[in-house]
Protein backbone atom coordinates (compact mmCIF):
# COMPACT_ATOMS: atom_id res chain seq x y z
CA UNK A 1 0.00 0.00 0.00
CA UNK A 2 0.98 3.68 -0.33
CA UNK A 3 3.32 5.57 2.00
CA UNK A 4 1.99 6.04 5.50
CA UNK A 5 2.97 8.61 8.13
CA UNK A 6 4.28 6.22 10.76
CA UNK A 7 4.52 7.60 14.29
CA UNK A 8 6.30 4.42 15.34
CA UNK A 9 5.86 2.62 18.66
CA UNK A 10 4.51 5.01 21.26
CA UNK A 11 6.14 3.61 24.41
CA UNK A 12 4.94 6.63 26.39
CA UNK A 13 1.55 4.94 26.35
CA UNK A 14 2.51 1.57 27.79
CA UNK A 15 -1.05 0.39 28.46
CA UNK A 16 -1.53 -2.20 31.18
CA UNK A 17 -4.84 -4.00 31.70
CA UNK A 18 -5.88 -6.85 33.96
CA UNK A 19 -6.52 -10.31 32.58
CA UNK A 20 -10.17 -11.36 32.32
CA UNK A 21 -11.46 -7.79 32.62
CA UNK A 22 -12.95 -5.47 30.02
CA UNK A 23 -10.59 -2.95 28.47
CA UNK A 24 -11.36 -0.02 26.18
CA UNK A 25 -8.38 1.41 24.36
CA UNK A 26 -8.62 4.63 22.41
CA UNK A 27 -6.53 5.03 19.28
CA UNK A 28 -3.73 7.41 20.37
CA UNK A 29 -3.68 9.09 16.94
CA UNK A 30 -6.54 11.41 17.86
CA UNK A 31 -5.32 12.08 21.39
CA UNK A 32 -1.66 12.85 20.81
CA UNK A 33 -0.66 12.95 17.15
CA UNK A 34 -3.35 14.43 14.92
CA UNK A 35 -5.05 17.82 15.17
CA UNK A 36 -8.52 16.47 14.42
CA UNK A 37 -10.82 14.00 16.20
CA UNK A 38 -12.34 10.72 15.06
CA UNK A 39 -15.71 12.23 14.10
CA UNK A 40 -14.03 14.72 11.76
CA UNK A 41 -11.89 11.96 10.25
CA UNK A 42 -14.89 9.67 9.79
CA UNK A 43 -17.04 12.33 8.15
CA UNK A 44 -14.11 13.11 5.82
CA UNK A 45 -14.26 9.50 4.58
CA UNK A 46 -11.22 8.18 6.48
CA UNK A 47 -11.26 4.61 7.78
CA UNK A 48 -9.71 3.47 11.07
CA UNK A 49 -8.00 0.08 10.85
CA UNK A 50 -6.59 -1.93 13.74
CA UNK A 51 -4.01 -4.71 13.66
CA UNK A 52 -1.41 -6.11 16.02
CA UNK A 53 1.87 -7.93 16.53
CA UNK A 54 1.73 -10.52 19.28
CA UNK A 55 4.38 -10.67 22.01
CA UNK A 56 7.74 -12.09 20.86
CA UNK A 57 6.66 -12.03 17.18
CA UNK A 58 7.46 -9.54 14.46
CA UNK A 59 4.58 -10.55 12.21
CA UNK A 60 1.70 -8.12 11.79
CA UNK A 61 -1.69 -9.80 12.13
CA UNK A 62 -5.26 -8.64 11.61
CA UNK A 63 -7.32 -8.55 14.79
CA UNK A 64 -10.00 -11.20 14.95
CA UNK A 65 -13.29 -9.34 15.27
CA UNK A 66 -15.29 -12.56 14.77
CA UNK A 67 -14.60 -14.17 18.14
CA UNK A 68 -17.45 -15.70 20.18
CA UNK A 69 -19.51 -13.10 22.08
CA UNK A 70 -17.65 -10.34 20.21
CA UNK A 71 -14.77 -10.62 22.66
CA UNK A 72 -12.82 -8.06 20.64
CA UNK A 73 -14.68 -5.30 18.83
CA UNK A 74 -14.13 -1.81 17.49
CA UNK A 75 -16.45 1.09 18.19
CA UNK A 76 -15.53 4.46 16.66
CA UNK A 77 -11.93 5.09 17.79
CA UNK A 78 -12.02 2.53 20.62
CA UNK A 79 -10.78 -1.05 20.60
CA UNK A 80 -12.80 -3.12 23.07
CA UNK A 81 -11.86 -6.33 24.85
CA UNK A 82 -14.76 -8.04 26.67
CA UNK A 83 -12.74 -9.39 28.40
CA UNK A 84 -8.98 -9.55 27.89
CA UNK A 85 -6.92 -12.73 27.75
CA UNK A 86 -3.26 -13.06 28.71
CA UNK A 87 -2.22 -13.72 25.13
CA UNK A 88 -3.74 -10.43 23.94
CA UNK A 89 -0.41 -8.90 25.04
CA UNK A 90 1.38 -7.29 22.11
CA UNK A 91 1.88 -4.12 20.09
CA UNK A 92 -1.34 -2.72 18.63
CA UNK A 93 -1.49 -0.41 15.62
CA UNK A 94 -4.31 1.90 14.65
CA UNK A 95 -4.14 3.27 11.13
CA UNK A 96 -6.27 6.03 9.65
CA UNK A 97 -6.43 6.03 5.86
CA UNK A 98 -8.18 6.60 2.59
CA UNK A 99 -6.81 6.51 -0.94
CA UNK A 100 -4.81 9.73 -0.49
CA UNK A 101 -4.01 9.87 3.24
CA UNK A 102 -2.50 7.48 5.75
CA UNK A 103 -1.29 7.87 9.34
CA UNK A 104 -0.59 5.17 11.92
CA UNK A 105 0.79 4.64 15.41
CA UNK A 106 1.58 1.52 17.42
CA UNK A 107 1.43 1.15 21.19
CA UNK A 108 2.21 -1.66 23.62
CA UNK A 109 -0.62 -3.39 25.46
CA UNK A 110 0.27 -5.64 28.38
CA UNK A 111 -2.32 -7.93 29.91
CA UNK A 112 -1.25 -8.60 33.50
CA UNK A 113 -2.32 -11.08 36.13
CA UNK A 114 -3.22 -10.12 39.68
CA UNK A 115 -3.40 -12.22 42.82
CA UNK A 116 -6.29 -12.37 45.28
CA UNK A 117 -4.87 -9.34 47.12
CA UNK A 118 -4.62 -7.31 43.89
CA UNK A 119 -0.84 -7.53 43.75
CA UNK A 120 0.45 -7.37 40.18
CA UNK A 121 3.19 -5.87 37.98
CA UNK A 122 0.78 -3.02 37.19
CA UNK A 123 2.31 0.46 37.58
CA UNK A 124 0.14 2.22 40.14
CA UNK A 125 -0.91 5.86 40.07
CA UNK A 126 -0.12 7.78 43.26
CA UNK A 127 -2.72 9.96 44.95
CA UNK A 128 -1.42 12.37 47.58
CA UNK A 129 -3.51 13.33 50.59
CA UNK A 130 -2.61 16.17 52.96
CA UNK A 131 -1.97 15.13 56.52
CA UNK A 132 -4.66 16.15 59.05
CA UNK A 133 -6.32 18.46 56.55
CA UNK A 134 -10.03 17.65 56.79
CA UNK A 135 -12.18 15.54 54.44
CA UNK A 136 -10.42 14.43 51.25
CA UNK A 137 -11.56 11.96 48.57
CA UNK A 138 -10.08 9.60 46.07
CA UNK A 139 -12.11 8.47 43.05
CA UNK A 140 -12.04 5.08 41.35
CA UNK A 141 -10.03 5.92 38.21
CA UNK A 142 -10.46 5.03 34.51
CA UNK A 143 -13.97 3.60 34.61
CA UNK A 144 -15.66 6.14 32.33
CA UNK A 145 -17.17 4.75 29.15
CA UNK A 146 -17.43 1.13 30.31
CA UNK A 147 -21.16 1.21 31.03
CA UNK A 148 -24.00 3.69 30.40
CA UNK A 149 -25.20 6.02 33.15
CA UNK A 150 -28.41 3.99 33.36
CA UNK A 151 -26.39 1.03 34.73
CA UNK A 152 -25.79 1.16 38.47
CA UNK A 153 -22.62 -0.81 39.24
CA UNK A 154 -21.62 -2.14 42.64
CA UNK A 155 -18.33 -0.79 43.96
CA UNK A 156 -16.26 -2.44 46.67
CA UNK A 157 -13.20 -0.74 48.15
CA UNK A 158 -10.19 -2.51 49.67
CA UNK A 159 -7.11 -1.36 51.53
CA UNK A 160 -4.44 -3.88 50.64
CA UNK A 161 -6.25 -7.17 50.98
CA UNK A 162 -8.98 -6.00 53.32
CA UNK A 163 -12.45 -4.83 52.41
CA UNK A 164 -13.05 -1.34 53.77
CA UNK A 165 -15.93 -1.47 56.20
CA UNK A 166 -16.15 0.02 59.67
CA UNK A 167 -12.81 1.80 59.27
CA UNK A 168 -12.43 4.74 61.67
CA UNK A 169 -11.60 7.51 59.25
CA UNK A 170 -12.15 5.96 55.79
CA UNK A 171 -15.64 5.73 54.31
CA UNK A 172 -16.62 4.17 50.94
CA UNK A 173 -19.14 6.33 49.10
CA UNK A 174 -19.77 4.65 45.73
CA UNK A 175 -17.03 5.60 43.28
CA UNK A 176 -15.41 7.76 45.96
CA UNK A 177 -13.48 6.84 49.07
CA UNK A 178 -13.55 9.57 51.71
CA UNK A 179 -10.82 10.16 54.28
CA UNK A 180 -12.31 12.13 57.16
CA UNK A 181 -8.81 12.98 58.31
CA UNK A 182 -5.66 11.51 56.80
CA UNK A 183 -2.81 10.14 58.88
CA UNK A 184 0.47 8.45 57.98
CA UNK A 185 -1.24 5.14 58.84
CA UNK A 186 -3.48 5.68 55.79
CA UNK A 187 -0.53 5.20 53.43
CA UNK A 188 -1.02 2.13 51.25
CA UNK A 189 -2.66 0.64 48.20
CA UNK A 190 -6.40 1.13 47.74
CA UNK A 191 -8.41 -0.92 45.26
CA UNK A 192 -11.89 -0.37 43.92
CA UNK A 193 -13.66 -3.28 42.22
CA UNK A 194 -16.50 -2.14 39.98
CA UNK A 195 -18.98 -4.84 38.99
CA UNK A 196 -21.53 -4.22 36.25
CA UNK A 197 -23.85 -6.27 34.01
CA UNK A 198 -23.78 -6.23 30.20
CA UNK A 199 -25.81 -8.41 27.83
CA UNK A 200 -26.45 -11.06 30.46
CA UNK A 201 -22.80 -11.19 31.55
CA UNK A 202 -21.10 -9.73 34.61
CA UNK A 203 -17.84 -7.83 34.28
CA UNK A 204 -15.39 -6.60 36.88
CA UNK A 205 -13.06 -3.62 36.68
CA UNK A 206 -10.19 -3.56 39.17
CA UNK A 207 -8.37 -0.28 39.79
CA UNK A 208 -5.60 0.11 42.35
CA UNK A 209 -3.91 3.32 43.41
CA UNK A 210 -1.32 4.19 46.01
CA UNK A 211 -2.27 6.71 48.67
CA UNK A 212 0.60 8.77 50.07
CA UNK A 213 -0.05 11.11 52.97
CA UNK A 214 2.03 14.27 52.56
CA UNK A 215 2.71 17.54 54.37
CA UNK A 216 -0.20 19.92 54.54
CA UNK A 217 -0.11 23.29 52.77
CA UNK A 218 -1.24 24.77 56.11
CA UNK A 219 2.21 23.94 57.49
CA UNK A 220 4.23 24.84 54.40
CA UNK A 221 7.05 27.38 54.73
CA UNK A 222 9.57 28.87 52.30
CA UNK A 223 12.84 26.92 51.91
CA UNK A 224 15.03 26.90 55.03
CA UNK A 225 18.82 26.94 54.54
CA UNK A 226 20.44 25.08 57.46
CA UNK A 227 23.91 25.36 56.01
CA UNK A 228 25.83 27.53 55.28
CA UNK A 229 25.05 29.57 58.36
CA UNK A 230 26.58 32.30 60.52
CA UNK A 231 28.15 29.87 62.98
CA UNK A 232 30.61 28.22 60.65
CA UNK A 233 33.67 29.77 59.02
CA UNK A 234 35.40 27.84 56.24
CA UNK A 235 39.08 28.61 56.81
CA UNK A 236 41.49 27.01 54.35
CA UNK A 237 45.08 27.32 53.26
CA UNK A 238 45.81 27.51 49.52
CA UNK A 239 46.22 23.99 48.10
CA UNK A 240 43.75 22.43 50.52
CA UNK A 241 40.33 21.07 49.50
CA UNK A 242 37.40 23.40 50.09
CA UNK A 243 34.11 21.65 50.83
CA UNK A 244 30.99 23.70 51.55
CA UNK A 245 27.65 21.98 52.03
CA UNK A 246 24.39 23.73 51.27
CA UNK A 247 21.62 21.93 53.13
CA UNK A 248 18.07 23.10 52.50
CA UNK A 249 14.74 21.96 53.93
CA UNK A 250 11.67 22.19 51.70
CA UNK A 251 8.11 21.76 52.97
CA UNK A 252 6.06 19.42 50.78
CA UNK A 253 4.18 21.41 48.16
CA UNK A 254 2.06 19.76 45.47
CA UNK A 255 3.62 20.20 42.02
CA UNK A 256 6.35 22.46 43.34
CA UNK A 257 9.81 22.33 41.80
CA UNK A 258 12.45 22.50 44.51
CA UNK A 259 15.73 23.97 43.37
CA UNK A 260 19.11 24.45 45.03
CA UNK A 261 22.08 26.08 43.34
CA UNK A 262 25.38 27.76 44.13
CA UNK A 263 26.71 31.01 42.75
CA UNK A 264 30.37 32.03 42.91
CA UNK A 265 30.87 35.76 42.66
CA UNK A 266 27.30 35.99 41.43
CA UNK A 267 27.77 33.50 38.58
CA UNK A 268 26.84 29.86 38.06
CA UNK A 269 29.86 27.57 38.80
CA UNK A 270 29.96 26.49 35.14
CA UNK A 271 30.67 30.10 34.15
CA UNK A 272 33.69 30.42 36.45
CA UNK A 273 37.13 29.27 35.21
CA UNK A 274 37.85 27.11 38.25
CA UNK A 275 37.54 23.36 38.81
CA UNK A 276 34.37 23.10 40.88
CA UNK A 277 32.44 19.90 41.58
CA UNK A 278 28.94 19.88 42.99
CA UNK A 279 27.42 16.68 44.41
CA UNK A 280 23.77 16.55 45.36
CA UNK A 281 21.92 14.26 47.70
CA UNK A 282 18.22 14.25 48.47
CA UNK A 283 16.28 12.76 51.35
CA UNK A 284 12.59 12.79 52.18
CA UNK A 285 10.62 12.69 55.40
CA UNK A 286 7.61 10.42 55.77
CA UNK A 287 5.34 13.27 54.62
CA UNK A 288 7.60 14.02 51.62
CA UNK A 289 9.19 17.13 53.04
CA UNK A 290 12.55 17.25 51.29
CA UNK A 291 16.09 17.93 52.39
CA UNK A 292 18.53 18.68 49.58
CA UNK A 293 22.26 18.91 50.13
CA UNK A 294 24.60 20.28 47.50
CA UNK A 295 28.27 20.04 48.41
CA UNK A 296 30.49 22.47 46.57
CA UNK A 297 34.02 21.15 46.24
CA UNK A 298 37.24 22.75 45.02
CA UNK A 299 40.03 20.18 45.16
CA UNK A 300 42.98 22.60 45.43
CA UNK A 301 41.77 26.00 46.47
CA UNK A 302 43.81 29.10 45.59
CA UNK A 303 44.15 32.32 47.57
CA UNK A 304 41.99 34.00 44.85
CA UNK A 305 39.27 31.34 45.37
CA UNK A 306 39.29 32.07 49.09
CA UNK A 307 38.43 35.71 48.36
CA UNK A 308 35.38 34.83 46.26
CA UNK A 309 31.74 35.05 47.37
CA UNK A 310 30.02 31.61 47.69
CA UNK A 311 26.23 31.86 47.94
CA UNK A 312 23.73 29.03 48.24
CA UNK A 313 20.30 29.68 46.72
CA UNK A 314 17.05 27.79 47.15
CA UNK A 315 13.65 28.17 45.55
CA UNK A 316 10.23 26.55 45.84
CA UNK A 317 6.67 27.64 45.13
CA UNK A 318 6.74 29.27 48.60
CA UNK A 319 9.63 31.59 47.81
CA UNK A 320 13.33 32.03 47.21
CA UNK A 321 16.14 32.36 49.77
CA UNK A 322 19.93 32.68 49.68
CA UNK A 323 22.76 32.41 52.18
CA UNK A 324 26.45 33.23 51.78
CA UNK A 325 29.14 30.98 53.22
CA UNK A 326 31.90 32.64 55.24
CA UNK A 327 35.15 31.63 53.54
CA UNK A 328 38.57 32.84 54.77
CA UNK A 329 42.22 32.16 54.10
CA UNK A 330 43.76 30.57 57.16
CA UNK A 331 46.59 32.60 58.67
CA UNK A 332 49.61 30.26 59.19
CA UNK A 333 50.17 29.52 62.91
CA UNK A 334 53.42 30.90 64.40
CA UNK A 335 56.21 28.35 64.90
CA UNK A 336 56.63 27.34 68.55
CA UNK A 337 59.63 25.75 70.30
CA UNK A 338 59.08 22.38 71.98
CA UNK A 339 59.17 24.11 75.37
CA UNK A 340 56.76 26.78 74.23
CA UNK A 341 52.99 26.76 74.37
CA UNK A 342 52.72 24.75 71.14
CA UNK A 343 50.42 22.16 72.74
CA UNK A 344 47.46 24.48 72.92
CA UNK A 345 48.03 25.81 69.41
CA UNK A 346 48.00 22.24 68.12
CA UNK A 347 44.77 21.49 69.98
CA UNK A 348 43.17 24.61 68.57
CA UNK A 349 44.18 23.55 65.04
CA UNK A 350 42.63 20.11 65.53
CA UNK A 351 39.48 21.68 66.98
CA UNK A 352 39.22 24.08 64.04
CA UNK A 353 39.71 21.22 61.55
CA UNK A 354 37.14 19.02 63.29
CA UNK A 355 34.66 21.87 63.42
CA UNK A 356 34.99 22.58 59.71
CA UNK A 357 34.95 18.91 58.76
CA UNK A 358 31.79 18.35 60.75
CA UNK A 359 30.12 21.23 58.95
CA UNK A 360 31.47 20.16 55.58
CA UNK A 361 29.87 16.77 56.10
CA UNK A 362 26.70 18.37 57.40
CA UNK A 363 24.40 16.62 54.95
CA UNK A 364 25.55 13.15 55.86
CA UNK A 365 23.37 12.65 58.91
CA UNK A 366 20.33 12.43 56.60
CA UNK A 367 19.09 8.98 55.67
CA UNK A 368 18.35 7.44 52.22
CA UNK A 369 20.82 9.49 50.19
CA UNK A 370 20.64 9.31 46.44
CA UNK A 371 23.91 10.69 45.09
CA UNK A 372 23.78 12.46 41.76
CA UNK A 373 27.21 13.30 40.43
Amino acid sequence: SERCDDWGLDTMRQIQVFEDEPARIKCPLFEHFLKFNYSTAHSAGLTLIWYWTRQDRDLEEPINFRLPENRISKEKDVLWFRPTLLNDTGNYTCMLRNTTYCSKVAFPLEVVQKDSCFNSPMKLPVHKLYIEYGIQRITCPNVDGYFPSSVKPTITWYMGCYKIQNFNNVIPEGMNLSFLIAFISNNGNYTCVVTYPENGRTFHLTRTLTVKVVGSPKNAVPPVIHSPNDHVVYEKEPGEELLIPCTVYFSFLMDSRNEVWWTIDGKKPDDIPIDVTINESISHSRTEDETRTQILSIKKVTSEDLKRSYVCHARSAKGEVAKAATVKQKVPAPRYTVEGGGGTGGLNDIFEAQKIEWHEGGGHHHHHHHHHH
Partner: antibody, heavy 119, light 107 residues
Framework: QVQLVQSGAEVKKPGSSVKVSCKAS????????ISWVRQAPGQGLEWMGG????????FYAQKFQGRVTITADESTSTAYMELSSLRSEDTAVYYC????????????WGQGTLVTVSS | EIVMTQSPATLSVSPGERATLSCRAS??????LAWYQQKPGQAPRLLIY???TRATGIPARFSGSGSGTEFTLTISSLQSEDFAVYYC?????????FGQGTKVEIK
Protein backbone atom coordinates in the same frame (compact mmCIF):
# COMPACT_ATOMS: atom_id res chain seq x y z
CA GLN B 1 -22.17 -15.37 -9.04
CA VAL B 2 -18.75 -14.30 -7.73
CA GLN B 3 -15.89 -14.93 -10.14
CA LEU B 4 -12.14 -14.47 -9.65
CA VAL B 5 -10.19 -14.37 -12.89
CA GLN B 6 -6.41 -14.55 -12.72
CA SER B 7 -3.72 -13.47 -15.18
CA GLY B 8 -2.00 -16.00 -17.43
CA ALA B 9 0.95 -18.32 -16.87
CA GLU B 10 4.42 -16.83 -16.46
CA VAL B 11 7.96 -18.11 -17.01
CA LYS B 12 10.57 -16.24 -14.99
CA LYS B 13 14.31 -16.29 -14.41
CA PRO B 14 15.74 -16.87 -10.92
CA GLY B 15 16.23 -13.58 -9.07
CA SER B 16 13.49 -11.78 -10.99
CA SER B 17 9.96 -10.83 -9.84
CA VAL B 18 6.49 -11.86 -10.91
CA LYS B 19 3.21 -9.99 -10.47
CA VAL B 20 -0.03 -11.96 -10.70
CA SER B 21 -3.43 -10.26 -10.91
CA CYS B 22 -6.86 -11.39 -9.74
CA LYS B 23 -9.95 -9.58 -11.02
CA ALA B 24 -13.19 -10.00 -9.09
CA SER B 25 -16.67 -9.69 -10.53
CA UNK B 26 -20.25 -10.59 -9.62
CA UNK B 27 -20.12 -9.48 -5.99
CA UNK B 28 -18.71 -6.95 -3.52
CA UNK B 29 -14.92 -6.66 -3.64
CA UNK B 30 -13.71 -3.98 -1.24
CA UNK B 31 -14.96 -5.34 2.08
CA UNK B 32 -13.89 -8.96 1.56
CA UNK B 33 -10.45 -10.43 2.15
CA ILE B 34 -8.49 -11.63 -0.86
CA SER B 35 -5.91 -14.28 0.00
CA TRP B 36 -3.14 -15.79 -2.05
CA VAL B 37 -2.45 -19.51 -1.76
CA ARG B 38 0.18 -21.41 -3.70
CA GLN B 39 0.62 -25.07 -4.60
CA ALA B 40 3.96 -26.46 -5.77
CA PRO B 41 3.75 -29.40 -8.24
CA GLY B 42 2.44 -32.50 -6.45
CA GLN B 43 2.36 -30.64 -3.10
CA GLY B 44 -0.25 -29.27 -0.74
CA LEU B 45 -1.72 -25.79 -0.33
CA GLU B 46 0.33 -23.01 1.28
CA TRP B 47 -1.24 -19.74 2.40
CA MET B 48 0.91 -16.67 1.57
CA GLY B 49 -1.00 -13.60 2.73
CA GLY B 50 -4.07 -11.48 2.24
CA UNK B 51 -5.61 -8.03 2.00
CA UNK B 52 -8.98 -6.36 2.50
CA UNK B 53 -8.98 -3.86 -0.39
CA UNK B 54 -11.06 -1.28 1.49
CA UNK B 55 -8.53 -1.27 4.34
CA UNK B 56 -5.46 -1.44 2.14
CA UNK B 57 -3.25 -3.19 4.69
CA UNK B 58 -1.76 -6.53 3.68
CA PHE B 59 -0.73 -9.31 6.04
CA TYR B 60 1.75 -12.04 5.22
CA ALA B 61 2.86 -15.46 6.38
CA GLN B 62 6.27 -15.32 8.07
CA LYS B 63 7.84 -17.45 5.34
CA PHE B 64 7.07 -14.84 2.66
CA GLN B 65 7.55 -11.68 4.72
CA GLY B 66 9.75 -9.22 2.86
CA ARG B 67 9.51 -11.08 -0.45
CA VAL B 68 5.82 -10.84 -1.24
CA THR B 69 3.73 -7.69 -1.72
CA ILE B 70 -0.05 -7.90 -1.90
CA THR B 71 -1.98 -4.87 -3.12
CA ALA B 72 -5.48 -4.10 -4.37
CA ASP B 73 -7.05 -1.55 -6.67
CA GLU B 74 -10.63 -0.88 -5.60
CA SER B 75 -11.44 1.04 -8.80
CA THR B 76 -10.83 -2.05 -10.96
CA SER B 77 -11.74 -4.69 -8.34
CA THR B 78 -8.33 -6.25 -8.86
CA ALA B 79 -5.90 -7.71 -6.34
CA TYR B 80 -2.20 -8.26 -7.06
CA MET B 81 0.48 -10.50 -5.66
CA GLU B 82 4.10 -9.70 -6.41
CA LEU B 83 6.82 -12.17 -5.44
CA SER B 84 10.44 -11.05 -5.73
CA SER B 85 13.85 -12.76 -5.68
CA LEU B 86 12.36 -15.80 -7.39
CA ARG B 87 14.00 -19.20 -7.02
CA SER B 88 13.22 -22.56 -8.56
CA GLU B 89 11.27 -23.61 -5.43
CA ASP B 90 8.77 -20.83 -6.19
CA THR B 91 7.57 -22.78 -9.23
CA ALA B 92 3.91 -23.33 -8.35
CA VAL B 93 0.31 -22.60 -9.20
CA TYR B 94 -0.71 -19.37 -7.43
CA TYR B 95 -4.40 -19.04 -6.48
CA CYS B 96 -6.33 -16.02 -5.27
CA UNK B 97 -9.31 -16.78 -3.06
CA UNK B 98 -11.98 -14.70 -1.36
CA UNK B 99 -13.29 -14.81 2.19
CA UNK B 100 -15.74 -12.60 4.04
CA UNK B 101 -13.06 -11.54 6.57
CA UNK B 102 -9.55 -12.39 7.66
CA UNK B 103 -10.94 -14.98 10.03
CA UNK B 104 -13.21 -16.82 7.64
CA UNK B 105 -13.19 -19.68 5.13
CA UNK B 106 -12.21 -19.30 1.47
CA UNK B 107 -15.51 -19.50 -0.39
CA UNK B 108 -14.46 -18.51 -3.94
CA TRP B 109 -11.21 -19.34 -5.76
CA GLY B 110 -9.52 -18.11 -8.92
CA GLN B 111 -8.55 -20.63 -11.61
CA GLY B 112 -4.85 -20.42 -10.67
CA THR B 113 -1.76 -19.00 -12.39
CA LEU B 114 1.22 -21.24 -13.10
CA VAL B 115 4.52 -19.50 -12.43
CA THR B 116 7.59 -21.39 -13.64
CA VAL B 117 11.00 -20.26 -12.42
CA SER B 118 13.74 -21.61 -14.63
CA SER B 119 17.08 -20.45 -15.93
CA GLU C 1 1.79 -21.27 13.84
CA ILE C 2 -0.78 -24.04 14.12
CA VAL C 3 0.20 -27.28 12.42
CA MET C 4 -2.62 -29.23 10.77
CA THR C 5 -2.05 -32.97 10.35
CA GLN C 6 -4.30 -35.08 8.11
CA SER C 7 -4.61 -38.85 8.12
CA PRO C 8 -4.41 -41.08 6.30
CA ALA C 9 -2.28 -39.65 3.46
CA THR C 10 -4.15 -41.91 1.05
CA LEU C 11 -7.51 -43.62 1.48
CA SER C 12 -8.58 -46.41 -0.91
CA VAL C 13 -12.36 -46.81 -0.98
CA SER C 14 -14.83 -48.53 -3.29
CA PRO C 15 -17.68 -46.45 -4.78
CA GLY C 16 -20.75 -46.50 -2.54
CA GLU C 17 -18.64 -47.04 0.58
CA ARG C 18 -18.18 -44.62 3.45
CA ALA C 19 -14.96 -42.57 3.72
CA THR C 20 -13.74 -41.02 6.98
CA LEU C 21 -10.95 -38.44 6.84
CA SER C 22 -9.23 -37.09 9.92
CA CYS C 23 -7.63 -33.74 10.65
CA ARG C 24 -5.79 -32.84 13.86
CA ALA C 25 -4.69 -29.32 14.96
CA SER C 26 -1.57 -28.76 17.09
CA UNK C 27 -3.69 -26.50 19.34
CA UNK C 28 -7.37 -25.69 19.64
CA UNK C 29 -8.94 -23.93 16.68
CA UNK C 30 -12.43 -24.02 18.20
CA UNK C 31 -14.81 -24.71 15.29
CA UNK C 32 -12.91 -22.51 12.86
CA LEU C 33 -12.08 -25.23 10.38
CA ALA C 34 -12.88 -25.67 6.70
CA TRP C 35 -12.63 -28.64 4.31
CA TYR C 36 -11.80 -28.27 0.60
CA GLN C 37 -11.91 -30.71 -2.29
CA GLN C 38 -9.40 -30.47 -5.14
CA LYS C 39 -9.43 -32.41 -8.38
CA PRO C 40 -6.40 -32.58 -10.72
CA GLY C 41 -5.88 -29.35 -12.68
CA GLN C 42 -8.62 -27.53 -10.78
CA ALA C 43 -8.74 -24.98 -7.99
CA PRO C 44 -9.86 -26.17 -4.54
CA ARG C 45 -13.58 -26.02 -3.79
CA LEU C 46 -15.10 -25.23 -0.38
CA LEU C 47 -17.07 -28.15 1.10
CA ILE C 48 -17.48 -27.46 4.82
CA TYR C 49 -16.91 -24.40 7.05
CA UNK C 50 -17.36 -23.90 10.78
CA UNK C 51 -16.28 -27.57 11.13
CA UNK C 52 -19.76 -28.86 10.27
CA THR C 53 -21.70 -26.47 7.99
CA ARG C 54 -22.01 -27.48 4.35
CA ALA C 55 -21.23 -24.78 1.79
CA THR C 56 -23.84 -23.80 -0.80
CA GLY C 57 -24.47 -26.54 -3.36
CA ILE C 58 -22.56 -29.28 -1.51
CA PRO C 59 -24.41 -32.63 -1.42
CA ALA C 60 -25.69 -33.98 1.90
CA ARG C 61 -23.37 -37.01 1.71
CA PHE C 62 -20.56 -34.70 2.89
CA SER C 63 -20.58 -34.02 6.62
CA GLY C 64 -18.08 -32.53 9.04
CA SER C 65 -17.72 -32.90 12.77
CA GLY C 66 -15.39 -32.10 15.65
CA SER C 67 -14.12 -29.07 17.53
CA GLY C 68 -10.97 -28.01 19.33
CA THR C 69 -8.19 -30.17 17.90
CA GLU C 70 -9.91 -33.23 16.37
CA PHE C 71 -11.99 -33.03 13.20
CA THR C 72 -13.54 -35.50 10.78
CA LEU C 73 -14.87 -35.26 7.24
CA THR C 74 -17.24 -38.08 6.34
CA ILE C 75 -18.43 -38.97 2.85
CA SER C 76 -21.32 -41.34 3.50
CA SER C 77 -21.49 -43.00 0.09
CA LEU C 78 -18.67 -42.27 -2.32
CA GLN C 79 -19.62 -41.28 -5.86
CA SER C 80 -17.18 -41.39 -8.76
CA GLU C 81 -16.88 -37.58 -8.75
CA ASP C 82 -15.73 -37.64 -5.10
CA PHE C 83 -12.35 -39.21 -5.84
CA ALA C 84 -10.02 -36.26 -5.22
CA VAL C 85 -7.63 -34.72 -2.67
CA TYR C 86 -9.21 -33.22 0.46
CA TYR C 87 -7.60 -30.48 2.55
CA CYS C 88 -8.51 -29.14 5.99
CA UNK C 89 -7.68 -25.55 6.90
CA UNK C 90 -7.87 -23.62 10.17
CA UNK C 91 -8.81 -19.95 10.18
CA UNK C 92 -8.84 -19.51 13.95
CA UNK C 93 -5.27 -18.29 14.31
CA UNK C 94 -3.09 -16.18 12.09
CA UNK C 95 -1.53 -17.28 9.83
CA UNK C 96 -4.03 -19.66 8.24
CA UNK C 97 -2.65 -23.15 7.78
CA PHE C 98 -3.66 -26.17 5.69
CA GLY C 99 -3.25 -29.85 6.29
CA GLN C 100 -1.02 -31.75 3.83
CA GLY C 101 -4.07 -33.39 2.23
CA THR C 102 -5.69 -36.81 2.02
CA LYS C 103 -6.01 -38.46 -1.38
CA VAL C 104 -9.20 -40.50 -1.77
CA GLU C 105 -8.66 -43.04 -4.54
CA ILE C 106 -10.73 -45.84 -6.07
CA LYS C 107 -10.07 -49.20 -4.51
Amino acid sequence: QVQLVQSGAEVKKPGSSVKVSCKASGGPFSQHAISWVRQAPGQGLEWMGGIIPFEGVAFYAQKFQGRVTITADESTSTAYMELSSLRSEDTAVYYCARSSSYYSWLDYWGQGTLVTVSS
Amino acid sequence: EIVMTQSPATLSVSPGERATLSCRASQSVSSNLAWYQQKPGQAPRLLIYGASTRATGIPARFSGSGSGTEFTLTISSLQSEDFAVYYCQQYNNWPWTFGQGTKVEIK
